[in-house]
């Protein structure tokens, strides 16, 4: 699996999950999130050669097409597969509230 | 929606579905598919600016991060959203068989 366990331990050029720390205020301009100050959102990147963690029959077909037609611009792309939520603290006026934001942290990638 | 109805009618630079005809023999080397000879598989391409058909909160966050940090390599990617099957005819020896291959035709795209 192209997950954090594998990708963070290996120097993998092809599609894999990469570490990315985002500071809510500095990187997004989000002043409304009080805690945490930032988090590891991570991201997916790297080429998708034929059969590498293909998501659908279409991505398999497209990967093969791209291999046999390397000049073609059509190729699968490395995108998130498994995502996890992030719990944040925010305020309504002076009242603290806790919310779980879904699909905030990339744990693994796929070729789609 | 970034679907064939919209994308095939507009000169859209950003993420959209693009027409792509694949000939099974010539483009894939698949001699085993007897009918059809080829089909419109289509593919997704184009930049994913902030909020363009964002798939998850993570892709929204990543799009905003990329807007405010344009030198960063992390950005959402344009990938298939809705896919349709394709019915094919193949042979087992001299016995014709019909099979529906799932997720073969891209009908719309998203930024993931």
């Amino acid at each position: 699996a192209l997950d954090t366990n594998y990708c963070f331990r290996n120097l993998e050029e092809n599609c894999c999950v990469r570490p990315l720390y985002i500071d809510f205020r500095q990187d997004l301009g989000w002043k409304w999130v009080h805690e945490p100050k930032g988090y590891y959102a991570n991201f997916c990147s790297g080429p998708c050669p034929y059969l590498r963690s293909a998501d659908t029959t279409h991505s398999t077909v497209l990967g093969l097409y791209n291999t046999l037609n390397p000049e073609a611009s059509a190729s699968p792309c490395c995108v998130p597969q498994d995502l996890e939520p992030l719990t944040i603290l925010y305020y309504v006026g002076r009242t603290p509230k806790v919310e779980q934001l879904s699909n905030m942290v990339v744990k693994s990638c796929k070729c789609s | 929606a970034l679907d064939t109805n919209y994308c095939f009618r507009n000169l859209e630079e950003n993420c959209c579905v693009r027409p792509l005809y694949i000939d099974f023999r010539q483009d894939l080397g698949w001699k085993w598919v007897h009918e059809p000879k080829g089909y419109y598989a289509n593919f997704c391409s184009g930049p994913c600016p902030y909020l363009r058909s964002a798939d998850t909160t993570h892709s929204t966050v990543l799009g905003l991060y990329n807007t405010l940090n344009p030198e960063a390599s992390a950005s959402p990617c344009c990938v298939p959203q809705d896919l349709e099957p394709l019915t094919i005819l193949y042979y087992v020896g001299r016995t014709p068989k019909v099979e529906q291959l799932s997720n073969m035709v891209v009908k719309s795209c998203k930024c993931s």
Partner: nanobody, 126 residues
């Protein structure tokens, strides 16, 4: 482009009512925080209350609690400040402010808002 335009100010007698409107444009659908502030002559800008456009969560300052109510109409992209039982000390210029980035919540602090309306004058006198 983000814009906030207030209206509804005017002159009213003590005990009277006014409803201020803040028309919001350039925000992502149903998202963002709107705060109401007022500035009396020679005083600092004071936070009166705020609302989260997504879920309608509101907060009101103690000085106006029970008299002022904030509501929103996401179809009309408008946030309202209903002011009842007005007092002479409620006079000043009233501003709405916006933070389009807020997925949840809203702030009582003016420094948290990037966008401001032009203000509308409220006078309370007999």
């Amino acid at each position: 482009e983000v814009q906030l335009v207030e209206s509804g100010g005017g002159e009213v007698r003590p005990g009277g009512s006014l409803r201020l409107s803040c028309v919001v444009s350039g925000f992502t659908k149903d998202y963002g925080a709107i705060g109401w502030f007022r500035q009396a002559p020679g005083q600092e800008r004071e936070g009166l209350g705020c609302i989260a456009r997504k879920d309608g969560d509101t907060w009101s300052a103690d000085s106006v609690k029970g008299r002022f109510t904030i509501s929103r109409d996401n179809v009309r992209n408008t946030v309202y400040l209903q002011m009842n039982a007005l007092k002479p000390e409620d006079r000043g210029v009233y501003y709405c402010a916006g933070d389009p980035s807020a997925l949840y919540g809203c702030s009582d602090r003016s420094s948290e808002y990037q966008y401001w309306g032009q203000g509308t004058q409220v006078t309370v006198s007999s």
